[in-house]
């Protein structure tokens, strides 16, 4: 945008000038695009509720697990195996957890009667030894259960292990019991209470509504709003077997998704429950599969502190609450509409692409001559000409040349480097169509000049016979009327140009040249047309008339204003004009680039 120069520059508006193409094909393409885009925009607006301001859910969760399990434990007492029955209630199998999680114990390993003293390590690859050299005093291995004393002692039979200071007897390295001791935990139920809030919309609700039947059990299709879940059903939903997971433990996600429409006319805000296994069920044994931890029950016996160490395997349930609440918002709607408006420009981009492609030189030279069915596409060349105005960068080297014996104009956009302009080939450019309305501005004298005595009144053609070349005309001259340039050696080649490419009559002999370019009456009219009160002395009048004549010739032979600016007049024409409107003294300056 141009810099502001005055106050009036601020109060202005620019708009684009467009070309309207009346075409059934392109009209259809345009409406096809518009209908498709409009349909998609409307569909997305409604289906994704893009007219709403959305806010993430803020939630709190509280859980209660219910159920009783009978556990049959096998214990060894005085070397004899015994089966002990015990009942586990909620307090026995659940542990207080922080955050939105609860834990249910499904299996365990007990090491009873541990006290702090010295004893041999449990035999493993890292603890077995053959001599004291295999143990190190004060050594604490991360996998060990105590601090080594540096002695290698008998563990059992001929097995020797490093002695440690630890809670003894050391916990055995053994597999979790199979089947899981609390296999019946599959039938436990959990009640999930979930309160949610959308503070931005000032809306609060919960998953348990007042009229809920508290004896229900969640079912994906039959009872999807019930907040009481059977643990076995949760695993069935994810395609896992509760009994298998119960052995080593695992982590299960309970997802509560709130997709709330808070608009009065479509109000809906109920949770959707789903389940997802969160631990890696394919984990290698060495990477500690499942979910377990240790806890101890401490007690005193004969004034000696003892403990029962329990390695607990179980399932941790993580409750993941997420979702959004949306409410109509005019700003969101306006922003959405604004963001989609640009899509309607796709039709224009696509149609412009077709016009540009079908009007390319490639199509003109390689496709249209051979493909008859592509012929109708030639019309795109016409559309392209109407749509686009091609302009050449006005470099100092840019020049246009027009020969009277050629239908086209030549564009020369290079340095001449001492070569005559007459001999430089240049690039062929189509001659712009004549705008006859411009002729109406010329004086009446031009339209109805009396016939010249001795000449017929029909159209005056250039005389057919070639003008004999005068001895003074340069080698590059084809009409016999050109004169050598008076410019310095370096600039001379620019004026070495004839009105013809091949030998023939000079354009200056044409009647129209005399009437359009040399007529003092016409030129004065044109000067006064621009400046009605122009009053000039003889010398400056000649200068003005001479430059006006140059301009008339350029406009006549080159048509386009852009080309006329860079037109090089043939030597014969230039000298004929200079003869008619001479300079009183000094040299003629020659062509100067306008930019």
């Amino acid at each position: 945008m141009p810099a502001c120069c005055s106050c009036s520059d601020v109060f202005q508006y620019e708009t684009n000038k467009v070309t309207r193409i009346q075409s059934m094909n392109y009209g259809t393409i345009k409406w096809f695009f518009h209908v498709i885009i409009f349909s998609y925009v409307c569909f997305a607006l409604v289906s994704d509720k893009l007219y709403q301001r959305k806010e993430p859910v803020i939630s709190s969760v509280h859980t209660k697990v219910k159920g009783i399990a009978e556990v049959k434990e096998e214990i060894v007492e005085n070397g004899v195996k015994k089966l002990v029955h015990s009942v586990f209630d909620t307090a026995d199998y659940t542990f207080p957890l922080q955050g939105n999680s609860f834990f249910v114990m499904t299996n365990f390993l007990k090491t009873e009667g541990q006290e702090q003293r010295l004893c041999p390590e449990y035999p493993t690859r890292r603890t077995l030894c053959s001599s004291d050299r295999g143990c190190k005093k004060g050594w604490m291995d991360p996998q060990s259960k105590g601090i080594q004393t540096g002695r290698c002692v008998v563990y059992e039979g001929n097995q020797k292990t490093c002695e440690v200071s630890a809670w003894c007897p050391i916990e055995a390295v053994e597999e979790a019991p199979r089947p899981a001791l609390l296999n019946s935990a599959e039938n436990f139920t959990v009640l999930i209470k979930n309160n949610i809030d959308f503070p931005g919309h000032n809306y609060t609700t919960r998953n348990i509504l007042p009229g809920l039947n508290i004896t229900c059990t969640f079912h994906k299709t039959q009872n999807p709003q019930c907040p009481i879940f059977r643990l076995g059903d949760i695993f069935r939903e994810t395609g896992d077997n509760f009994s298998d997971v119960a052995i080593q433990g695992g982590i299960m996600g309970i997802e509560i998704y709130w997709d709330c429409n808070l608009d009065r006319w479509f109000h809906h805000c109920r949770p959707k429950y789903s389940f997802r296994r969160l631990d890696d069920k394919t984990t290698n044994v060495s990477l500690y599969p499942g979910y377990n931890f240790r806890y101890a029950k401490y007690y005193k016996e004969n004034n000696v502190e003892k403990r029962t160490l329990i390695k607990v395997f179980g399932i941790r349930f993580d409750i993941l609450v997420f979702g959004t609440g949306g409410k109509f918002d005019i700003i969101q709607l306006v922003v959405y509409i604004g963001s989609t408006l640009s899509y309607f420009g796709l039709a224009a981009v696509f149609i412009d692409f077709l016009i540009d492609t079908y009007s390319s030189n490639c199509c003109r030279s390689h496709i249209y001559p051979w493909c008859k069915c592509c012929q109708p596409c030639v019309v795109n060349e016409y559309y392209y000409r109407k749509k686009c105005e091609s302009i050449v960068e006005p470099k100092p080297t840019l020049k246009y040349v027009s020969f009277v014996d050629e239908s086209h104009i030549r564009m020369v956009n290079q340095q001449l480097l001492g070569r005559s302009l007459q001999d430089v080939k240049g690039q062929e450019v189509p001659r712009p169509a004549m705008d006859f309305t411009d002729l109406s501005r010329l004086p009446l004298a031009l339209h109805d000049t009396p016939p010249i005595p001795g000449q017929p009144e029909e159209i005056q053609l250039l005389r057919k016979e070639a003008t004999p070349r005068s001895r003074d005309s340069p080698v590059w001259c084809q009409c016999g009327s050109c004169l050598p340039s008076q410019l310095p050696e370096s600039h001379r080649c620019l004026e070495e140009l004839c009105c013809r490419k091949k030998p023939g009559a000079c354009i200056t002999t044409s009647e129209l040249f005399r009437k359009l370019v040399l007529s003092r009456h016409v030129l004065q009219f044109l000067l006064l047309y621009q400046e009605p009160l122009l009053a000039l002395d003889v010398d400056s009048t000649n200068s003005r008339l001479r430059h006006c004549a140059y301009r008339c010739y350029a406009t006549w032979r080159f048509g386009s204003q852009d080309m006329a600016d860079f037109a090089i007049l043939p030597s014969c024409c230039r000298w004929r004009i200079r003869k008619e409107f001479p300079k009183s003294e000094g040299q003629y300056s020659g062509f100067k680039s306008p930019y």
């Epitope: 690859r125 890292r126 077995l128 030894c129 053959s130 050299r133 295999g134 050594w139 291995d141 060495s286």
Partner: nanobody
Framework: EVQLVESGGGVVQPGGSLRLSCAAS????????MGWFRQAPGKEREFVAA???????DYGDSVKGRFTISRDDAKNTVPLQMNSLKPEDTALYYC???????????????????????WGQGTLVTVSS
């Protein structure tokens, strides 16, 4: 899983030298501590030399100063250079590997046969005049 193959055994005169080599298969060779053990007829398996995955070495008391263990992780081999051999060095020499992926074997435990999970078939060394 690592397969170990010993080679280089044979008959040598006392004071002579011999070079045993242990070739291991498996891409994770560089994560294993490697050891050499020997067992003379009617005797317990005895520690000879070992090298951890990070290059620390340990030698049995009877071979210190005479034997040298090294490792070539590019070729997956563990050579044992035995110099100044004595008739009491006659035994079946075994190559062994201990996985250190989940934790390095402490230096003072490199001599313990219990640390080693994988064992070769053995190569016989006879020192006799």
């Amino acid at each position: 899983e690592v397969q170990l193959v010993e080679s280089g055994g044979g008959v040598v005169q006392p004071g002579g030298s011999l070079r045993l080599s242990c070739a291991a298969s498996g891409r994770t060779f560089r994560h294993y501590a490697m050891g050499w053990f020997r067992q003379a007829p009617g005797k317990e398996r005895e520690f000879v030399a070992a090298i951890s995955s990070y290059g620390s070495t340990d030698y049995g008391d009877s071979v210190k100063g005479r034997f040298t263990i090294s490792r070539d992780d590019a070729k997956n081999t563990v050579p044992l250079q035995m110099n100044s051999l004595k008739p009491e060095d006659t035994a079946l020499y075994y190559c062994a590997a201990a996985d250190e992926t989940l934790g390095a074997v402490p230096n003072f435990r490199l001599h313990e046969k219990y640390e080693y999970e994988y064992w070769g078939q053995g190569t016989l060394v006879t020192v006799s005049s």
